[in-house]
C-alpha cells in the first residue's frame, strides 16, 4: 500500500424513535462474527431507506455502536446484540462512534486494523503553531532587553 488511511474519531449520542418498520438498520460484528480484526464490536452495515435511522440522518453505515440505552455492546454474540436492539423499546438511545476517513499521502485501501488512528497533521499543525508563537515571543522578548 502506498499511503496510509487514518481516522478522526468522534462520539455522539443518538436518540431514535422506533418507526412503523422499526429502527431501520442492519448490523455486523460480535464475538462470533468479527467485522474488524481483533474487535468484536457492533457496526452499522446498512441504513434502510425511509427508516427511522435514515430519517434522523445522523447514524451512518460504518459507525460503531458502543451502547444501546446505556447497555454496553462489548463482548456480545452477534445474535445477542441483535436481540438487544429488538427489545430496546420505543425510544432508543445509541452511543455511536463515527470514523471520518482522512487520507494521508498517496491513496491506499482502507485497512482492517485499529480503527482509532489520529491523522498525523492533527498533531503536527498545533505543534508547528506553538513553535511559531514561541519563536515570535522569544524575539519580542530579546528586542525588549
Amino acid at each position: 500500500m502506498n499511503g496510509r488511511v487514518d481516522y478522526l474519531v468522534t462520539e455522539e449520542e443518538i436518540n431514535l424513535t422506533r418507526g412503523p418498520s422499526g429502527l431501520g438498520f442492519n448490523i455486523v460484528g460480535g464475538t462470533d462474527q468479527q467485522y474488524v480484526s481483533n474487535d468484536s464490536g457492533i457496526y452499522v452495515s446498512r441504513i434502510k431507506e425511509n427508516g427511522a435511522a435514515a430519517l434522523d440522518g445522523r447514524l451512518q453505515e460504518g459507525d460503531k455502536i458502543l451502547s444501546v440505552n446505556g447497555q454496553d455492546l462489548k463482548n456480545l454474540l452477534h445474535q445477542d446484540a441483535v436481540d438487544l436492539f429488538r427489545n430496546a423499546g420505543y425510544a432508543v438511545s445509541l452511543r455511536v462512534q463515527h470514523r471520518l476517513q482522512v487520507q494521508n499521502g498517496p491513496i491506499g485501501h482502507r485497512g482492517e486494523g485499529d480503527p482509532s488512528g489520529i491523522p498525523i497533521f492533527m498533531v503536527l499543525v498545533p505543534v508547528f503553531a506553538l513553535t511559531m508563537v514561541a519563536a515570535w515571543a522569544f524575539m519580542r522578548y530579546r528586542q525588549q532587553l
Partner: nanobody
C-alpha cells in the same frame, strides 16, 4: 455513499469468456453484500449473482449456474464476475450493486432480490 464502477465488458464470440470487475469506493467495502444484475434490450433487469459481505455465501441465477463465478477481493474493494461459455442470450448491460450485509435489528425477513441501495452505471456485454 458508495460509488460503483463496472469494467471488463465488450464484444466476444459465443463460447468465449469475459471477466467483469466492479470497483467500490466511499464506504467500508467489506460490510456490503454485492450483486450482479443484467438487462437485455427491451427486457426487465434480472438477477445474475450475489456474494455475501463475508464472501462465504454465493448465489446464482439458474441460467448462469456452472458458467459464471462471482468473487470478491476486500483488499482491492472489488467484486468480480467470471463469465465462461458465453451465449448470445447473455448479451446485456451488466450492473453491479451493493447493500449493507449483516442482520436487520428489526426483524428476520428475506431481502428482496432487487433490494439494493447502490448501483453502478453498467457495462455492455455483447456475445455474437
Amino acid at each position: 455513499e458508495v460509488q460503483l464502477v463496472e469494467s471488463g465488458g465488450g464484444l466476444v464470440q459465443a463460447g468465449g469468456s469475459l471477466r467483469l470487475s466492479c470497483a467500490a469506493s466511499g464506504r467500508p467495502f467489506n460490510m456490503y453484500d454485492m450483486g450482479w444484475f443484467r438487462q437485455a434490450l427491451g427486457k426487465e433487469r434480472e438477477f445474475v449473482s450475489t456474494v455475501s459481505w463475508t464472501g462465504s455465501s454465493t448465489n446464482y441465477a439458474d441460467s448462469v449456474k456452472g458458467r459464471f463465478t462471482i468473487s470478491r477481493d476486500n483488499a482491492k474493494n472489488t467484486v468480480y464476475l467470471e463469465m465462461n461459455s458465453l451465449k448470445p442470450e447473455d448479451t446485456a448491460v451488466y450492473y453491479c450493486a451493493a447493500r449493507g450485509g449483516g442482520t436487520s435489528v428489526d426483524s428476520d425477513y428475506d431481502v428482496g432480490e432487487f433490494e439494493y441501495d447502490y448501483w453502478g452505471q453498467g457495462t455492455q456485454v455483447t456475445v455474437s
